[in-house]
Interface confidence: low
């Protein structure tokens, strides 16, 4: 749904904003600036992202942020233009390193 503005908005998250567990990966300068395509979140039994843009983005979780999350799973949220860690239970902090 509209949450995808945050599942894609993360890429754009400003470096100077200190939001817990958000890290901005290096910008892709060639990325097109304006699109109002409506990416849909995958839902069980629902539409499977059919409106998502075809252009495949490199997921920084598979590259420079591969080992970033200590006790958690790396998540790349496109709109935010950044990486976040989904922490395992009992862990928190930017890299899920605190208990």
């Amino acid at each position: 749904g509209l949450n995808d503005i945050f599942e894609a908005q993360k890429i754009e998250w400003h470096e100077s904003v200190r939001v817990e567990q958000v890290v901005k990966p290096p910008q892709n300068k060639t990325e097109s600036e304006n699109t109002s395509d409506k990416p849909k979140r995958k839902k069980k039994g629902g539409k499977n992202g059919k409106n998502r843009r075809n252009r495949k983005k490199k997921n920084p979780c598979n590259a420079e942020f591969q080992n970033f999350c200590i006790h958690g799973e790396c998540k790349y949220i496109e709109h935010l233009e950044a990486v976040t860690c989904k922490c395992q239970q009992e862990y928190f902090g930017e890299r899920c390193g605190e208990k």
């Epitope: 894609a8 817990e20 709109h79 899920c96």
Partner: antibody, heavy 124, light 111 residues
Framework: EVKLMESGGDLVKPGGSLKLSCVAS????????MSWVRQTPEKRLEWVAT????????YYPDSVKGRFTISRDNAKNTLYLQMSSLRSEDTAMYYC?????????????????WGQGTSVTVSS | DILLTQSPASLAVSLGQRATISCKAS??????????LNWYQQKPGQPPKLLIY???NLESGIPARFSGSGSGTDFTLNIHPVEEEDAATYYC?????????FGGGTKLEIR
């Protein structure tokens, strides 16, 4: 202190246009997605538009799509809503709201700060 | 669209008693272990104010007498003990799927 101040509301005839502004202060405006939400005279709240931090992504409900355009100027800490082909059903108090999306590493679609609103009346 | 139905439309509660407001969604608004349902309070002449996010998380600075519960399609806002300053209209808001939708509101009066 986070502040959002809307302006630009007016009385306009059906079919007319209007541009609303929302000036933000007290936070790093460029770091937050923003939305416009309106409240009808019957006190119903309706989401109008959302824009991502870098303005790459914009979202609208079908009721305003093609008529309203949300935009932002991060250098001026200002959010805009250009409204055209206005209808009587667009009469409402228009609020701008800030999205604070991440709590404890999980996304939640929170509109945590709202302005005081600006009134738009569409009538002949 | 996911529609939200709030009930009751209005209620009057005595000071110190419990106020319970229901919000029912036309389909599930859960995703990835969370419910994308928020509660807002609005007083006359003021904008809405966030109380509860993700169904049960209390917003910072909001008194602990406010609590939210529920998942899937059925959600509840409880206020206990009710205080004079709680007289307001309360709205639920779903954002699991666009368009974002708000409930019709529940007006709380303190007796």
């Amino acid at each position: 202190e986070v502040k959002l101040m809307e302006s630009g509301g007016d009385l306009v005839k059906p079919g007319g246009s209007l541009k609303l502004s929302c000036v933000a202060s007290g936070f790093t405006f460029s770091g937050y997605p923003m939305s416009w939400v309106r409240q009808t005279p019957e006190k119903r709240l309706e989401w109008v538009a959302t824009i991502s931090t870098g303005a790459r992504h914009t979202y609208y409900p079908d009721s305003v799509k093609g008529r309203f355009t949300i935009s932002r100027d991060n250098a001026k800490n200002t959010l805009y809503l250009q409204m055209s082909s206005l209808r009587s059903e667009d009469t409402a108090m228009y609020y701008c709201a800030r999205h604070e999306g991440l709590r404890r590493g999980k996304y939640h679609c929170i509109m945590d700060y709202w302005g005081q609103g600006t009134s738009v009346t569409v009538s002949s | 669209d996911i529609l939200l139905t709030q009930s009751p439309a209005s209620l009057a509660v005595s000071l110190g008693q419990r106020a319970t407001i229901s919000c029912k969604a036309s389909q599930s608004i859960d995703y990835d272990g969370d419910s994308f349902l928020n509660w807002y309070q609005q007083k006359p002449g003021q904008p809405p104010k966030l109380l509860i996010y993700a169904a049960s998380n209390l917003e910072s600075g909001i008194p602990a007498r406010f609590s939210g519960s529920g998942s899937g399609t059925d959600f509840t806002l409880n206020i206990h003990p009710v205080e004079e300053e709680d007289a307001a209209t309360y709205y639920c808001h779903q954002c699991n799927e666009d368009p974002y939708m708000f409930g019709g509101g529940t007006k709380l009066e303190i007796r």
